[in-house]
Interface confidence: low
């Protein structure tokens, strides 16, 4: 909140403030205004104006300080490349309009990195990555010249530096100076030149924050070897002993506004939820501030690692809490964080140097009192011994993310506060916090938390198998009889769970093909283990041609699976992994898990089906309440079951029933879906409750899933809670921690 904004309400007239081709809206009870233009246009010459003490609006000045009489909306242009080394770009033009494209080409002997073709986007930024022509002659790879910046320095040996500058009127985001480091990476982060009208889209923010706040839950060493021209993948270690402190710092000053404050709270709630879904427990600190900071949660509090409790505290914070003292003292807020980090009597506790600290600051960057907050960041770095020892700079132990919210964001201020790390972005400018909410839940990259069950890489760039990493495709080749296709689920490094009816006793291991992670190669099978009570011919004498009770099998693989982003286990009921996934207390019993996952009601669930070579999630409802009986009775419409007197002869207590039209019209399974998991999605994790066994109606004749299906089209799945003793016995060496 700049001092000039703190004036009595309505002291500036609105006469003549209109903008040609757009509109304006008042901020801060009439003490500021923001010009709003249609998509593809920006307000010229300024985006915001402030009401001065003289009772007049701040003048309309261009970047070169010329005064303009009337504001207007002008078409957004993307900046042109000032320099492009060792190659050419085409077409060359003094400016580029939205949707214009440019192409980059390298001279002989140079190789192009980044994007060869880039498009001018509606927000004034070029799509893709900085194009760089490099001959690999440097110790570090060429750091490139992001479009719109100018680079000084063209030597890329160890300890060489390059500096970047922006044209007048543009603000540099990222690192102005970068140094070639041992190992071939550049210090800092790639710079860019920002115009005041430029915002990060929710997708950009999600993606950049997502890939930066990467963590390995298993506690992999953060120092990765890598060479020139390669980006080092930095990993923040979130280990179960809670060696990470996350400080949530929320600006509650006048200039932020109530709606952005509420939006920011929602985003942080999502962030806490997402972190908690890993089964790890970082400690949280929670600070809001205006003229003074208010600490709501201290990292030293016993409950600071209890995600639900921290969320409750966050939800209870009111924007009005800072109303009477509504300046913006970011320095004091960060000092509150510093106080939480420091230790009594200056005696560092055991393990202080293994604790990683993440500060997430949501502000408009307009500190107007208390002095420059950057000094506190320096003090924090000092306290944590960061950047002092060249051999061990410990940069991984502090991350400062700054989210600039709203039109008054001071880009210089927020850039100064944020961390600068190679190939990462720590500073974001968002137009309106609410449009972030839908993507904020994505913002932690689970790509390294590999052995956690039921974990999914929810990312827009993710493939089918990033989104269903447990899914296995099974086919059985039978000479002269064609082949059978089924699905299965990875449940451990050596086992895939599927349906027994996918196989016959005559099937040899070598004729069974299993693939996971979307990989082309088939896995070698050691053995298929059937449930001992499965016998498809068990009731033939009673006139039941096929009997699917206990229709489950485990495929044991010869070689251990290598978990990765596209290959991960699903959670099984009554395991410790599921207890953690559901964030239940460690003392949780199997029965309590069952009540959580299969309550006596309609239960939202899903299965995964392959359609036109794509895996898709199908949402269904398990009828486990008052609709259960009618669901099971519809089994009589299945071919061969029409003569069955008592339906419980075929629908045993081992089955779960889905399908039908109530409460919603459920999609049905197809033949090729057999053996796949029936899944309950809870708390951002996926828990298998059933194995797809059989259906009443073949809704997929001629390879096409029929849209119109009868109400009696039901599907039956083996309830895993009913085959637990067998699972426990067969998977006893798999470290799943059965309860």
């Amino acid at each position: 909140t700049p001092w000039s904004l703190a004036r009595p309400q309505g002291s500036c007239s609105l006469e003549g403030v209109e903008i040609k081709g757009g509109s304006f809206r008042l901020l801060q009870e009439g003490q500021a205004l923001e010009y709003v233009c249609p998509s593809g246009f920006y307000p010229y010459p300024v985006q915001t104006r402030t009401c001065r003490s003289t009772g007049s609006w701040s003048t309309l000045k261009t970047q070169d300080q010329k005064t303009v009489r009337k504001a207007e909306c002008r078409a957004i242009h993307c900046p042109r490349p000032h320099d492009f080394e060792n190659g050419e770009y085409w077409p060359r033009s003094p400016y580029y309009n939205v949707s214009d494209e440019i192409s980059f080409h390298c001279y002989d002997g140079y190789t192009l990195r980044g994007s060869a073709n880039r498009t001018c986007q509606v927000n004034g930024r070029w799509s893709g990555q900085t194009a760089i022509c490099d001959n690999g002659a440097g110790y570090c790879s060429n750091p490139g010249i992001p479009i719109g910046t100018r680079k000084v320095g063209s030597q890329y040996r160890l300890e060489d530096s390059v500096t970047y500058h922006c044209s007048r009127g543009l603000t540099l985001r990222g690192s102005q100076r970068r140094t070639c480091q041992e190992g071939g990476s550049w210090s800092g982060t790639e710079p860019s030149c920002q115009d005041s009208f430029m915002y990060d889209t929710p997708q950009e923010v999600a993606e950049a924050f997502l890939s930066s706040l990467t963590e390995t839950i298993e506690g992999v060493d953060a120092e990765d070897g890598h060479g020139p021209g390669e980006q080092q993948k930095r990993k923040i270690v979130l280990d179960p002993s809670g060696s990470m402190n996350i400080y949530l710092v929320l600006d509650g000053s006048d200039s932020i506004g109530a709606s952005n404050f509420t939006g920011a709270k929602k985003c942080l709630v999502n962030l806490i939820e997402k972190v908690a879904s890993y089964g790890v427990k970082p400690r949280y600190g929670l600070v809001t501030y205006a003229t003074y900071p208010k600490i709501w949660v201290k990292v030293s509090e016993a409950d600071s690692s209890n995600a639900d409790w921290v969320t409750k505290q966050l939800n209870e914070i009111n924007y009005e809490d800072h109303k009477l003292k509504s300046g913006t003292n970011t320095k004091k807020a960060l000092q509150a964080v510093y106080s939480m980090m420091s230790w009594p009597d200056d005696v560092p506790p055991e393990g202080w140097n293994r604790t990683r600290h993440v500060i997430i600051l949501m502000t408009d960057g307009l500190h107007n009192m208390g002095g420059d907050p950057i000094t506190v960041i320096d003090e924090i770095r000092d306290l944590l011994y960061i950047g002092k020892d060249r051999k061990n700079p410990r940069e991984d132990y502090l991350d400062v993310y700054v989210f600039g919210v709203g039109p008054l964001v001071n880009q210089v201020n927020i850039n100064a506060l944020a961390s600068k790390k190679d190939n990462e972005q720590h500073v974001f400018k968002v137009k309106d916090m609410e449009n972030l909410e839908d993507v904020f839940y994505q913002m932690i990259d689970e790509s390294q938390s590999l052995s956690l069950c039921g974990m999914v890489w929810e990312h827009r760039k993710g493939t089918d198998y990033h989104k269903q990493p447990w899914q296995a495709k099974i086919s059985v080749i039978r000479p002269s009889k064609g082949h059978e296709s089924c699905m299965g689920a990875v449940v451990s490094e050596y086992f895939v769970l599927t349906a027994a009816h996918c196989f016959t006793v005559d099937d040899k291991e070598h004729s069974i093909k299993v693939s996971v992670g979307g990989e082309k190669r088939d896995l070698e099978i050691e053995v298929v283990l059937f449930h001992p009570n499965y016998n498809i011919n068990g009731k033939k004498e009673a006139g039941i041609p096929e009997f699917y009770d206990y229709d489950v099998a485990l495929i044991k693989l010869k070689n251990k699976l290598k978990y990765g982003q596209t290959i991960r286990p699903i959670c099984l009921p009554c395991t410790e992994g599921t207890t953690r996934a559901l964030r239940l207390p460690p003392t949780t019993t199997c029965q309590q898990q069952k009540e959580e996952l299969l309550p006596a009601q309609d239960i939202k669930a899903l299965f995964v089906s392959e359609e036109e070579k794509k895996l898709t999630r199908k949402e269904v409802y398990i009828k486990n309440g008052d609709k259960k009986g009618s669901c099971e009775r519809d089994a009589q419409y299945a071919p061969g079951y029409d003569k069955v007197k008592d339906i419980s002869e075929v629908v045993t207590p081992r089955f779960l029933c889905t399908g039908g039209v109530s409460p919603y019209a459920d999609p049905n399974t197809c033949r090729g879906d057999s053996g796949g998991p029936l899944i309950v999605h809870k708390r951002s994790r996926f828990i298998q409750v059933g194995v797809i066994s059989w259906g009443v109606v073949d809704v997929c004749k001629n390879q096409k899933r029929q849209k119109q299906v009868p109400a009696h089209a039901r599907d039956f799945h083996i309830n895993l809670f009913q085959v637990l003793p067998w699972l426990k016995e067969k998977l006893q060496d798999e470290d799943l921690g059965f309860l």
Partner: antibody, heavy 120, light 113 residues
Framework: EVQLVQSGAEVKKPGASVKVSCKAS????????MTWVRQAPGQGLEWMGW????????KYAQKFQGRVTMTRDTSISTAYMELSRLRSDDTAVYYC?????????????WGQGTLVTVSS | DIVMTQSPDSLAVSLGERATINCKSS????????????LAWYQQKPGQPPKLLIY???TRESGVPDRFSGSGSGTDFTLTISSLQAEDVAVYYC?????????FGQGTKLEIK
């Protein structure tokens, strides 16, 4: 203890190819570039190029471009250097070497060398 | 490519005496911004791979006796053995890493007089 163990001596005819292996132990193979240097009999040392075992990315000296191929098998922590279209002046001892850091230019660890003799 | 020229080609020095080997580069190896020289010295004994002695022109590798020292800047560099020992008989190479390709000198053979 860091160790680089190379394959045994080879005798090749001109025009043929040779593939020398270098098995690493005592450290994380994928964390450090593997560099290849050769030394003709009674001559000096000559840098041939490097491979990044993590990504498989390579950088070759211009002199060997088109004739040299560096590969690796991370499952057995082994780097390979294949030189094709051999000539008599390719007779040399071929060394693999590793620096202190991921891509350090200072070669602190060396293999014992593999003598390749090219003779008709 | 940067050419490295060592002198002399061979050198005979009495035990306990000082040995000096020179290395000249065809262009400066000094990074004026960091004041570092991109040069290393290696020792190679018969039938053995080379051994790193000095890097950054003057930084002694750990475990290397302090009788070995490196000096020089820009294009002219020197390796000095202050008091020659019998085990120092070897060929010594300088190497530049200022630019790719990294290049070595032709070597200097050090013998005992």
């Amino acid at each position: 203890e860091v160790q680089l163990v190379q394959s045994g001596a080879e005798v090749k005819k001109p025009g043929a190819s040779v593939k020398v292996s270098c098995k690493a132990s005592g450290y994380s193979f994928t964390d450090y570039y593997m560099t290849w240097v050769r030394q003709a009999p009674g001559q000096g040392l000559e840098w041939m190029g490097w491979i990044n075992p993590n990504s498989g990315g390579t950088k070759y000296a211009q002199k060997f471009q088109g004739r040299v191929t560096m590969t690796r098998d991370t499952s057995i922590s082994t780097a390979y250097m294949e030189l094709s279209r051999l000539r008599s002046d390719d007779t040399a001892v071929y060394y693999c070497a590793r620096g202190y850091y991921a891509n350090s230019a200072w070669f602190a660890y060396w293999g014992q060398g593999t003598l390749v003799t090219v003779s008709s | 490519d940067i050419v490295m020229t060592q002198s002399p080609d061979s050198l005979a020095v009495s035990l306990g005496e000082r040995a000096t080997i020179n290395c000249k580069s065809s262009q400066s190896l000094l990074n004026s911004r960091t004041s570092k020289n991109y040069l290393a010295w290696y020792q190679q004994k018969p039938g053995q791979p080379p051994k790193l002695l000095i890097y950054w022109a003057s930084t002694r590798e750990s475990g290397v006796p302090d009788r070995f020292s490196g000096s020089g800047s820009g294009t002219d560099f020197t390796l000095t053995i202050s008091s020659l020992q019998a085990e120092d008989v070897a060929v010594y190479y300088c190497k530049q890493v200022y630019n790719l390709p990294w290049t070595f000198g032709q070597g200097t053979k050090l013998e005992i007089k």
